[in-house]
């Protein structure tokens, strides 16, 4: 070996100076009697080497690097040899920091693995190989006096946690625990923890289950869930408190917390939830009243709350078939009595024959809002209920009675906008209890089955705004019936449009007779169309060759018109405009020529 490098320290604080010397032995002088020693750090040549010849003939170069800013680099001592640089020796230099004090040391006792798991934060990067050791000892008191040392726990490379196995633990006694960090630049120690492993026990959560329904147990009430949990086996005898959290599966609701629950409750009825709603539930527990750590949340249990029987008022209305008065068509509408009135699965119409105690005969069971049935001859009344899996609504009696009450008067209707109609009336005396308002297409499209109806509960009302199923350009029949205590009044009806359409065509003009100065025209009126308001008038327009225009207004019953004062042998353009309150439309143009003065008149 021709050269040898010595350094003041191979590992230094990052940014600190470092001094190195390189000695070239005399027996290498065949390279060059006065060789020039060069220094290189990594790939860069470093100036500043001070070279001298020693008394024994060796050459020495000393260099001081003022700041070592590389965390790792090779320092080389070189000679120029021909055109290349010959490395005589090199050393690895490292720079970094002493270890910071490890912080946030915490431990958990795991009863499944029977070990104490401690973790910490190692602090900033040192850039140097740094070892961590979890150190501990047993102590009878509060760790002021050190008992038996426990075997050091050395984590795997790169890990910041370590497990102390059961054989080195003493439960229900304090242990002193700390982390020691060490590298070439120093040693640091975390603050010491003093703990009883059982005080940092982390339990596993119980397993949530739905309760098996037992025949003798009452089913859960609406909006309630019955659940139970299986305690975590290793924690069977540990006093714990638990908390439950739940949220609806649908929507963005956040978790709602219920607790504390004693672990040993083992079963629980959770109420105050939305009926017929799927919920996600989780449970977690903590050793209590002794110290401990909360378990993780249990795996989710998904359960659906039972529904509640429908809480609705059923507004009813009925109609008899004209040809068969015992065939009744019954209509109803559910009106919720509460914010959550329960799901409606269907409806049942039933009749209880007099003298047959307890016997109830169903007349129809449907999911629709109406049904048609044959009313037994002795039946004056039926009952209607809404039902679901939880039960039925309160029965609504429907009494079939003759209309004996007074009629309302002055029934009228007017358009509010193209999709609504106002129907008004003068209430009869005495006041009714309410009204039924029915509406549907008038003739020729009229149909009893396609009528919309509404119950107006206020007997003093003098009108009602129809907003459902109203379309423009359609004729509607509106029927209003007053309702009394045990009877009803006669129905009244009125026809109305919410918006009428302008005539779609004007009649075609035909020339009947023509002369030199006159022309007789005629037309066939368009038949009236539903949805189109009746014609109010016609206007006839004629224009001569000089583009002069003339017009005349005719009443709606006109079938023809004679144009007078025309010029002989002249060309005229004529058209007819048919007008209603909703607008007007023009006919096609008729072009004619009056006769020459010498010509004979045409009839």
């Amino acid at each position: 070996e021709c050269g040898h490098i010595s350094v003041s320290a191979p590992i230094v604080h990052l940014g600190d100076p470092i001094t190195a010397s390189c000695i070239i032995k005399q027996n290498c002088s065949h390279l060059d009697p006065e060789p020039q020693i060069l220094w290189r750090l990594g790939a860069e040549l470093q100036p500043g080497g001070r070279q001298q010849r020693l008394s024994d003939g060796t050459q020495e170069s000393i260099i001081t690097l003022p700041h070592l800013n590389h965390t790792q680099a090779f320092l080389s001592c070189c000679l120029n040899w021909g055109n290349s640089l010959q490395i005589l020796d090199q050393v690895e230099l490292r720079a970094g920091y002493p270890p910071a004090i490890p912080h946030n040391l915490s431990c958990l006792m795991n009863l499944t693995t029977s070990s104490l798991i401690c973790q910490w934060e190692p602090g900033p990067e040192t850039h140097l190989p740094t070892s961590f050791t979890l150190k501990s000892f047993k102590s009878r008191g509060n760790c002021q006096t050190q008992g038996d040392s426990i075997l050091d726990c050395v984590p795997k490379d790169g890990q910041s946690h370590c497990c102390i196995p059961r054989k080195h633990l003493l439960l229900y006694q304090n242990m002193g625990i700390w982390v020691q960090a060490e590298n070439a630049l120093g040693t640091s120690m975390s603050p010491q923890l003093c703990l009883d492993p059982m005080d940092v026990v982390k339990l596993e959560p119980p397993m949530l289950r739905t309760m098996d329904p037992s025949p003798e147990a009452a089913p859960p009430q609406a909006g309630c869930l019955q659940l139970c949990w299986e305690p975590w086996q290793p924690g069977l005898h540990i006093n714990q408190k638990c908390e439950l959290r739940h949220k609806p599966q649908r929507g963005e609701a956040s978790w709602a917390l219920v607790g504390p629950l004693p672990l040993e409750a083992l079963q629980y009825e959770l109420c105050g939830l939305l009926p017929a709603t799927a919920y996600t539930l989780q449970i977690r527990c903590i050793r209590w009243p002794l110290p401990g750590h909360w378990s993780d949340w249990s795996p989710s249990l998904e359960l659906r709350t039972t529904e509640r029987a429908p809480t609705v008022r059923l507004d009813t209305w009925w109609r008899q078939r004209q040809l068969d008065p015992r065939t009744v068509q019954l209509f109803w509408k559910p009106v919720p009595l509460e914010e959550d009135s329960g799901r409606i699965q269907g409806y049942v119409v039933s009749w209880r024959p007099s003298g047959q105690a307890g016997a109830i005969l169903p007349l129809c069971n449907t999911t629709e809002l109406s049904c048609t049935f044959h009313l037994p001859s002795e039946a004056q009344e039926v009952a209607l209920v809404a039902y679901n899996s939880a039960g039925t609504s309160r029965p609504t009696p429907v009494v079939f009675s003759e209309s004996r009450g007074p009629a309302l008067t002055r029934l009228h209707a007017m358009a509010r906008d193209p999709h609504s109609l106002w129907v008004g009336w003068e209430p009869p005396n005495p006041w009714p209890q309410g009204y039924v308002i029915e509406w549907g297409l008038g003739p020729p499209s009229a149909s009893n089955s396609n009528k919309t109806w509404r119950m107006e509960q206020n007997g003093r009302a003098t009108g009602f705004l129809l907003k459902e199923n109203i379309r423009p350009f359609q004729l509607y029949e509106i029927i209003v019936t007053p309702l009394y205590q045990d009877t009803m009044g006669p129905s009244q009806h009125v026809y109305a449009y919410s918006q009428e359409m302008a005539p779609s065509h004007a009649p075609e003009l035909h020339l009947k007779h023509i002369g030199k100065t006159w022309a007789q025209l005629e037309w066939v009126p368009e038949p009236p169309e539903l949805g189109k308001s009746p014609l109010t008038h016609y206007t006839i327009f004629w224009t001569n060759a000089q583009n002069q225009s003339f017009s005349a207004i005719l009443n709606a019953s006109s079938r023809g018109f004679v144009l007078h004062g025309l010029e002989p042998a002249s060309l005229y353009h004529i058209h007819l405009m048919a007008a209603s309150q909703a607008g007007a439309t023009n006919s096609t143009v008729l072009t004619l020529m009056t006769l020459t003065p010498e010509g004979s008149e045409l009839h």
Epitope: T112, S114, L171, L236, H237, N239, P262, E264, L266
Partner: antibody, heavy 118, light 107 residues
Framework: EVQLLESGGGLVQPGGSLRLSCAAS????????MGWVRQAPGKGLEWVSS????????PYADSVKGRFTISRDNSKNTLYLQMNSLRAEDTAVYYC???????????WGQGTLVTVSS | DIQMTQSPSSLSASVGDRVTITCRAS??????LNWYQQKPGKAPKLLIY???NLQNGVPSRFSGSGSGTDFTLTISSLQPEDFATYYC?????????FGGGTKVEIK
Amino acid sequence: EVQLLESGGGLVQPGGSLRLSCAASGFTFSLYWMGWVRQAPGKGLEWVSSISSSGGVTPYADSVKGRFTISRDNSKNTLYLQMNSLRAEDTAVYYCAKLGELGMYMNWGQGTLVTVSS
Amino acid sequence: DIQMTQSPSSLSASVGDRVTITCRASQGISSYLNWYQQKPGKAPKLLIYYASNLQNGVPSRFSGSGSGTDFTLTISSLQPEDFATYYCQQSWTYGQTFGGGTKVEIK
């Protein structure tokens, strides 16, 4: 110092009943599971029943299920064992014991002898 | 139910001997195994809990080991006061069960 004192043992005819009591002192009774262990003459230890700190969980050995009832009164620091339909094979010394969190019997009473014989 | 099998059921040993008693569970019980010592006419006394933890006041010549199904109680140097019957007990389930016992007698 933990002390457990059993009472209520004695001679009873087959089919008869007895109620054992265990008075506890020297620790917070309401925080601990408690249990009964018996030992027939010349035989080993047999677990009979245990009860959770607030009395909600009460497991029993198959040999006594349906006949024995364990209970506790935390206000009186007392554990009970109601024994009905007694049989000759129930003859034993009955020990009351305090359980630790890991299910070990940390402290025992001195025992009370129950003899079932006609 | 979990069965606990203790062996031997009895053994003779001299003062100063190393004595080992084993206990086997019919299914895994983690570390939930406790050892008791009982002398004639006396209540049992807890020696070791959670397989290897020495109860306060118990001499360090007693030690426990094992996990899962196989457990051992070791007395490193038998003393005259150690002649007694030893029981293991599992506390993994609510229905705790004891082993049949091992009687340690003077040789």
